[in-house]
Amino acid sequence: GSSPRSGVLLRGCPTHCHCEPDGRMLLRVDCSDLGLSELPSNLSVFTSYLDLSMNNISQLLPNPLPSLRFLEELRLAGNALTYIPKGAFTGLYSLKVLMLQNNQLRHVPTEALQNLRSLQSLRLDANHISYVPPSCFSGLHSLRHLWLDDNALTEIPVQAFRSLSALQAMTLALNKIHHIPDYAFGNLSSLVVLHLHNNRIHSLGKKCFDGLHSLETLDLNYNNLDEFPTAIRTLSNLKELGFHSNNIRSIPEKAFVGNPSLITIHFYDNPIQFVGRSAFQHLPELRTLTLNGASQITEFPDLTGTANLESLTLTGAQISSLPQTVCNQLP
């Protein structure tokens, strides 16, 4: 049954909201999709989770959630926020997850984010953000996940990322980014997942991925690359690479020599005509390789050291004979 404390907790539940104990003598409060235009006023000080998403909240006053020192997750997605003032999150010392996606923010709310030292996950996707100030994440030393996809960014906010050394996953997809400069992510040594798909990226700095020593997943799909992304050569832990739906015409010799951990490579929907014979050597974890329409391939690829392929598809090539060693190279 419920303890006396949970009864006290539930008496602090705002009207029309759904509340339940979270198992730690704290309260989960769901006020989503209620047509609210402002924050509820009678929130329990013991609230650990507050969902205010899918309402009509258009502004936050400074310090709108006083005393919620146990609040760990705040959801404000799907409202009409255009601006978040300094002090909007004052006193939220335990806040780990902040969801601000699907609003109308034009800038990262730099001042409001200051001193959220416990914040681990920040969603700013699906807004109208075109500018990320250099110091906007400077106090977010615990941040692990950052969503900036589906905004209006035209360039990588290089300086803003310098303070995010604990970041593990980030998405910058669905923006209007056209170039990735050298050392764009130079301090993100803990980053494991980076999504850059659906941008307008046509050029990569020679050292644009330098510093990403933990990166395992890189998504460059649906961009305007017309050259193979040789900058990946520094990503020694890369497991999953996508650059499909670009304009890449050739894959050079030893293309993936710096990426011996690759398991998956997606590069379909590119007008690839040439593939270096040594391009896919020494990829012991690679399981699937599909080369469609590479019309200038005249020799079967040298798969030395790529011994665990389970599926190999070659269509549209001009290979006239198979090497005698082909059956030795494949499992």
Partner: antibody, heavy 118, light 111 residues
Framework: EVQLVQSGAEVKKPGASVKVSCKAS????????IEWVRQAPGQGLEWIGE????????DYNEKFKVRVTITRDTSTSTAYLELSSLRSEDTAVYYC???????????WGQGTLVTVSS | DIVMTQSPDSLAVSLGERATINCRAS??????????MHWYQQKPGQPPKLLIY???NLESGVPDRFSGSGSGTDFTLTISSLQAEDVAVYYC?????????FGQGTKVEIK
């Protein structure tokens, strides 16, 4: 602990070649650029070139391009600098260094003195 | 090539006093808000040691009496309170573009 240990001093005659080694330990050798820099006696520092061991990618200072070859052996985590057609003005201490944060040179070898003299 | 010019060539400062070294690049070394300028200390018979990266970021383990500032073409290394162990030659270096280039060095001595 990151360490770069270079080969010993060399004395060469003009026109000869020299190959200096740099053995790395304490980090993932393949993922960081190795830079080569030289310092003539009493002089400043001069960048020669770099290699990314994981991919064998190299870049050279145009000044040295025709005479310098930078290679690596990933099995022993060792980078090499070979300089040919030596002349007296190549007398210098040759350093290898790791390209660290934003390309700054965060760890250096102890240096190898190459003396070119007839 | 980008030419790096340091001033002064040498500097004598009393113990505990401030030492300031300037470095000017022949063109901007800034890119997307980062200044690709680094500072090194070299003592006799030793390899250089990284002090500051990206113009103003203190390398780990370096005493906080060292600081860097500047952007574009003009940069400064400051030692707020000179210690005896700071006697050395100091170099700035750019890696904004190949070839990477160093300043000629500034010798810091005790007055």
């Amino acid at each position: 602990e990151v360490q770069l240990v270079q080969s010993g001093a060399e004395v060469k005659k003009p026109g000869a070649s020299v190959k200096v080694s740099c053995k790395a330990s304490g980090y993932t050798f393949s993922a960081y650029w190795i830079e080569w820099v030289r310092q003539a006696p009493g002089q400043g520092l001069e960048w020669i070139g770099e290699i990314l061991p994981g991919s064998d990618s190299t870049d050279y200072n145009e000044k040295f391009k025709v005479r310098v070859t930078i290679t690596r052996d990933t099995s022993t985590s060792t980078a090499y600098l070979e300089l040919s057609s030596l002349r007296s003005e190549d007398t210098a201490v040759y350093y290898c260094a790791r390209g660290g944060h934003y390309g700054s040179l965060d760890y250096w070898g102890q240096g190898t003195l190459v003396t070119v003299s007839s | 090539d980008i030419v790096m010019t340091q001033s002064p060539d040498s500097l004598a400062v009393s113990l505990g006093e401030r030492a300031t070294i300037n470095c000017r690049a022949s063109e901007s070394v800034d890119n997307y808000g980062n200044s690709f300028m680094h500072w090194y200390q070299q003592k006799p018979g030793q390899p250089p040691k990284l002090l500051i990266y990206l113009a103003s970021n203190l390398e780990s383990g370096v005493p906080d009496r060292f600081s860097g500032s500047g952007s574009g073409t003009d940069f400064t290394l400051t030692i707020s309170s000179l210690q005896a162990e700071d006697v050395a030659v100091y170099y700035c270096q750019q890696n904004y573009e190949d070839p990477f280039t160093f300043g000629q060095g500034t010798k810091v001595e005790i007055k």
